[in-house]
């Protein structure tokens, strides 16, 4: 009943709880002298299903047969309507529609840890939509029985609150769960197990790692476990990896030596435990231990390259460049690089430690034979030095690679190809491809890039530090013993017509011809490698086509003579620049009149 029902009653037959698909009869009847004030024909009883009127009757009672009720709870309310008055609530009832419980499936029990309690889980099957009580029963040796009930609407877990002990690890226990509601009952199949089957150890704790003599090769992992643990699984991985290394160990007694860790690497370690070889289940993985392995001295050798620049008749500038070791080669934090410069005949040597840079520049005499050695040092030691004899890399003309070309290869890549030198190609020990941004001033501060190529290769794809619309000076060196030959070419990965033309800054007269001088186009406006300049001229106020002179682009050139102008005629001159993609717009216009004598 949903209220006091003083004025009447609502009865439900056969029951307030019905099976899905059943029909119920609902009767609403007024108690004596509870109808409308006037004679009873005017009593109008109305039956509501939630907020909807579903039936009515004039008189003292209303009978209604209801079908098709949905799963769950439906509220019916009976009201009385009298002429010219509000409806009065008489009484109401809730009807619960559901199904009998299905047989609980997959009953399984577990005890978490040796000191834990036995808890079981099962699958309820489809929702009954009714109050359903679950009873879990456990029977053991010596006729011992435990029982626990669950009145939660969605019950699929119960903890007995009892602890199984390892005194008789092979003793059998049997669990069964029974579901009961108003429409029926059903029991699971029994689940039989022993202590060893259901005890799931607690995950290991207090995990530590020790490196004997700060060496990665002598590493021991320690942990604590529950007393009966027989097996352990260890898994570990570098923190930046998704793949685990896995190790199974028996009777480890809380320690295990790891032999294959890499130096100077952060690892994540986890451990899991089990009581028996083939019974029971593994514990959850322990909390992760994160630890960095110690450094080891670097392996590998630095990739070193150099550049020579003539200063004057007695001095030359040497710029050394080297690449960082890979993480696996550095095996620690590189603290400094050691550069040793030695004059081979006189034995003079100087050593310098370089920090924070991967280049070094010095000035040495042009005479003598010079060699350098460069190594990388961390807290444990140094890499093997890379030794290079300083030579004139382009001196041997016969070693110069032939037919060097540079072509764009997709976004920000340049494919460099060449032919072996004319001199015995088998003499070549390796090729080095070097590239740097082209700066008209030949700026030595521009970063240098290089890669090494085996002697049988005749191409290399360069992609490191390559930007679109920038021209690169590319050199291919062929090295053989203490000799080298080189060839160079300009190349770009992407190009378009230059954004502006050269700016003419002066026109001077010399013996009947003129010399035009210009300022280079700013690098950011060249939009790739320049191929030609064009000088245009025409008589002022003339509508004729201009004449032009095309000059191949050379980095250092910024003037050119023209000797085909007529004296005492005023000309307008301008310049453009061309890349493989097209011609720039005009540079500035200059007027000039040649003063020389007429023929």
């Amino acid at each position: 009943k949903i209220d006091a029902c003083k004025r009447g009653d609502v009865t439900v037959k056969p029951s307030h709880v019905i099976l899905l698909g059943s029909t119920v009869n609902i009767t609403c009847s007024l108690k004596p002298r509870q109808g409308c004030f006037h004679y009873s024909r005017r009593n109008k009883l109305i039956l509501y299903k939630f907020d909807r009127r579903i039936n009515f009757h004039h008189g003292h009672s209303l009978n209604s047969q209801v079908t098709g009720l949905p799963l769950g709870t439906t509220l019916f309310v009976c009201k009385l309507a009298c002429i010219n008055s509000d409806e009065i609530q008489i009484c109401g009832a809730e009807i619960f529609v559901g199904v009998a419980p299905e047989q609980p499936q997959n009953l399984s029990c577990i005890q978490k840890g040796e000191q834990g309690t036995v808890a079981c889980t099962w699958e309820r099957g489809r929702d009954t939509h009714l109050y359903t009580e679950y009873t879990l029963q456990l029977s053991g040796p010596k006729n011992l029985t435990w029982q626990k009930q669950c009145k939660d609407i969605y019950c699929d877990y119960l903890d007995f609150g009892i602890n199984l002990t390892p005194e008789s690890p092979e003793s059998n226990f049997t669990a069964k769960v029974t579901a009961v509601n108003s429409l029926g009952s059903s029991s699971s199949l029994p689940s039989t197990f022993t202590f060893l089957d259901i005890v799931r150890p607690l995950p290991p704790w207090d995990i530590r790692i020790k490196f004997q003599k700060a060496s990665v090769s002598r590493c021991t992992l320690y942990w604590r476990d529950e007393g009966l643990v027989l097996l352990n699984r260890l898994r570990y991985r570098p923190s930046n990896s998704r793949l685990w290394n896995m190790v199974n160990v028996t009777k480890a007694k809380g320690r295990h030596d790891l032999l294959d860790l890499k130096p100077f690497t952060e690892y994540e370690f986890q451990i899991s435990s089990k009581l028996h070889l083939y019974k029971g289940s593994w514990s959850d993985w322990s909390e992760s231990l994160r630890a960095q392995t110690p450094e080891e001295e670097p392996t590998g050798m630095l990739d070193v390259w150099y550049m020579k620049r003539h200063i004057d008749y007695s001095r030359q500038q040497i710029s050394l460049f080297w690449k960082n070791l890979s993480v696996s080669e550095a095996r620690g934090k590189i603290l400094h690089y050691q550069v040793t410069l030695q004059e081979l005949t006189g034995g003079k040597a100087m050593t310098q430690n370089i920090t924070g840079h991967t280049s070094w520049t010095t000035v040495i005499p042009r005479t003598g034979n010079w060699a350098v050695a460069v190594s990388a040092a961390n807290s444990k030691g140094s890499s093997l030095p890379t030794r290079i004899n300083i030579m004139n890399l382009c001196e041997a003309g016969l070693l110069a690679p032939r037919q060097v070309s540079a072509n764009s290869e997709g976004m920000d890549n340049i494919l460099v190809t060449w032919q072996p030198p004319r001199k015995d190609p088998s003499a070549v020990q390796e090729y080095v491809v070097e590239w740097r941004e082209l700066h008209p001033g030949g700026d030595t501060q521009v970063p240098l890039n290089w890669l090494r190529s085996r002697p049988y290769n005749v191409s290399a794809l360069i992609s490191e530090n390559i930007k679109s619309y920038i021209c690169y000076e590319i050199r291919v060196y062929a090295l053989s013993g203490d000799q080298g030959g080189c060839s160079s070419i300009l190349g770009n990965s992407k190009h378009k017509a230059p954004l502006s033309g050269p700016h003419i800054n002066a026109i001077t007269e010399e013996k009947g011809s003129i010399l035009i001088s210009w300022n280079s186009i700013p690098v950011q406006e060249q939009m790739g490698c320049l191929l030609h300049y064009r000088i245009y001229w025409k008589e002022r106020d003339s509508n004729s086509q201009p004449q032009l002179c095309e000059i191949p682009y050379r980095v250092s050139q910024n003037s050119h003579p023209i000797n085909s102008l007529q004296p005492r005629v005023t000309y307008v001159l301008w310049m453009t620049a061309l890349t493989a993609a097209g011609e720039s717009s005009h540079g500035n216009e200059r007027e000039f009149c040649l003063q020389g004598k007429a023929n």
Epitope: T23, K44, I46, K49, R52, R53, I54, N55, F56, H57, H58, G59, L62, N63, S64, Q65, V66, T67, G68
Partner: nanobody, 125 residues
Framework: QVQLQESGGGLVQPGGSLRLSCKAS????????MSWVRQAPGKGLEWVSA????????DYADSVEGRFTISRDDAKNMLFLQMNSLKPEDTARYYC??????????????????WGQGTQVTVSS
């Protein structure tokens, strides 16, 4: 699924009579109270009459009381509305509906999908 099919409408002179029928299917007709509802051109739904699930009680809107009679035949799943002394203001499209979807209290338009096409009644001289 629930289906309701009305028939019997037509053109009639003021003062004349018509008998509307409704054939129900797709549900247990005898357990449901039923209603007649009408909709005049450009107007909302207006409840006209109802009969309870036993057929023993009937209700009428004030505007039709004494002129219209509702009845049902559970054996044939039929609902009827006998309309006498028709007036021009009775002109409308007439629908039958479950009482729970449209009663003298309110119409629940979310169930209107169950309704038939209705039958047109025109009262005119």
């Amino acid at each position: 699924q629930v289906q309701l099919q009305e028939s019997g409408g037509g053109l009639v002179q003021p003062g004349g009579s018509l008998r509307l029928s409704c054939k129900a299917s797709g549900f247990t007709f005898s357990t449901y109270a039923m209603s007649w509802v009408r909709q005049a051109p450009g107007k909302g739904l207006e409840w006209v009459s109802a009969v309870n699930s036993g057929g023993l009680s009937t209700d009428y809107a004030d505007s039709v009381e004494g002129r219209f009679t509702i009845s049902r035949d559970d054996a044939k799943n039929m609902l009827f509305l006998q309309m006498n002394s028709l007036k021009p203001e009775d002109t409308a499209r007439y629908y039958c509906a479950k009482y729970e979807d449209c009663s003298d209290y309110m119409c629940h338009r979310d169930r209107a999908g169950y309704w038939g096409q209705g039958t047109q009644v025109t009262v005119s001289s």
